[in-house]
Interface confidence: low
């Protein structure tokens, strides 16, 4: 499922090229392995901002599908409790392009450890 998440992120990246969305999103660009689940949940929350701001049905569908796949993959990790991790609001705000690049990196972390 994580591989499908990456292809969805690439699709979102392609779809937003033609749009002017100037939102900044809370982005964890240096994910510590012991905080990867917490960081992933922040990425998923912020992804919904793209869906709302784009107002585009294709982006909305892709975002929704990505969230299903990611949450399902996270649930197979069990109920992991991580402590000492940053809250979403403590993260740096970055533009959509940088946000999506960091998102791909964290998904790759999950692929490499699964």
């Amino acid at each position: 499922n994580w591989v499908n998440v990456i292809s969805d992120l690439k699709k979102i990246e392609d779809l937003i090229q033609s749009m002017h969305i100037d939102a900044t999103l809370y982005t964890e660009s240096d994910v510590h392995p012991s905080c990867k689940v917490t960081a992933m949940k922040c990425f998923l929350l912020e992804l919904q901002v793209i869906s709302l701001e784009s107002g585009d049905a294709s982006i909305h569908d892709t975002v929704e599908n990505l969230i299903i796949l990611a949450n399902n993959s996270l649930s197979s990790n069990g109920n992991v409790t991580e402590s000492g991790c940053k809250e979403c609001e403590e993260l740096e705000e970055k533009n959509i392009k940088e946000f999506l690049q960091s998102f791909v990196h964290i998904v790759q972390m999950f692929i490499n450890t699964s």
Partner: antibody, heavy 120, light 112 residues
Framework: QVQLVQSGAEVKKPGSSVKVSCKAS????????VHWVRQAPGQGLEWVGG????????VFAQKFQGRVTITADESTSTAYMELSSLRSEDTAVYYC?????????????WGQGTTVTVSS | DIVMTQSPLSLPVTPGEPASISCRSS???????????LDWYLQKPGQSPQLLIY???TLQSGVPDRFSGSGSGTDFTLKISRVEAEDVGVYYC?????????FGGGTKLEIK
Amino acid sequence: QVQLVQSGAEVKKPGSSVKVSCKASGYSFTDYYVHWVRQAPGQGLEWVGGINPKRGDTVFAQKFQGRVTITADESTSTAYMELSSLRSEDTAVYYCARGGLGVFGVVDVWGQGTTVTVSS
Amino acid sequence: DIVMTQSPLSLPVTPGEPASISCRSSQSLLHSNGYNYLDWYLQKPGQSPQLLIYAATTLQSGVPDRFSGSGSGTDFTLKISRVEAEDVGVYYCMQALQTPLTFGGGTKLEIK
């Protein structure tokens, strides 16, 4: 009207596989998830997994991961659920159900159920 | 996984009397969009489950208005204003916020 028609009852030996079909009609097959839910005799409902027929993406409950395969054939508007390495605890009625696409799609229409009996 | 807990297990009711079933989730089902992702189903004897209420409070088309749903967050209630003989069966709540979709253990409504 919207309908999901499932294949007939199956009796299987432990260790074998079963494949249950679910034919959809009365709506656009690719606009909705197809979920699979099972119910052991005298027990409650348990979600097995689901498929997005438009994309072929599947999601599963952790306990079935690696043992269940869910597929969809767009040309016949039919979804399939295959469960392998069957054991007696898999004896249940298996339902397919339509769910809205997206994270929060409500599961609104159910098939009539397929009884799978696993017995030596 | 989100755990759904229903009560009571069994509910004997006299026709014409009201009935109430409680469902509690182990975490909030209230999404940031304002909807609670909690659905109610009735499984009549020998039949497939049928949807009664979705998003905690919205009555499914064709379902009699004697059924109503309330609640938010982690506590939800299904009410039947006047029970009829055809309402017998097992009632299930289900959370649709995230996979795995999870169901309550069921409440068996029977006529006294």
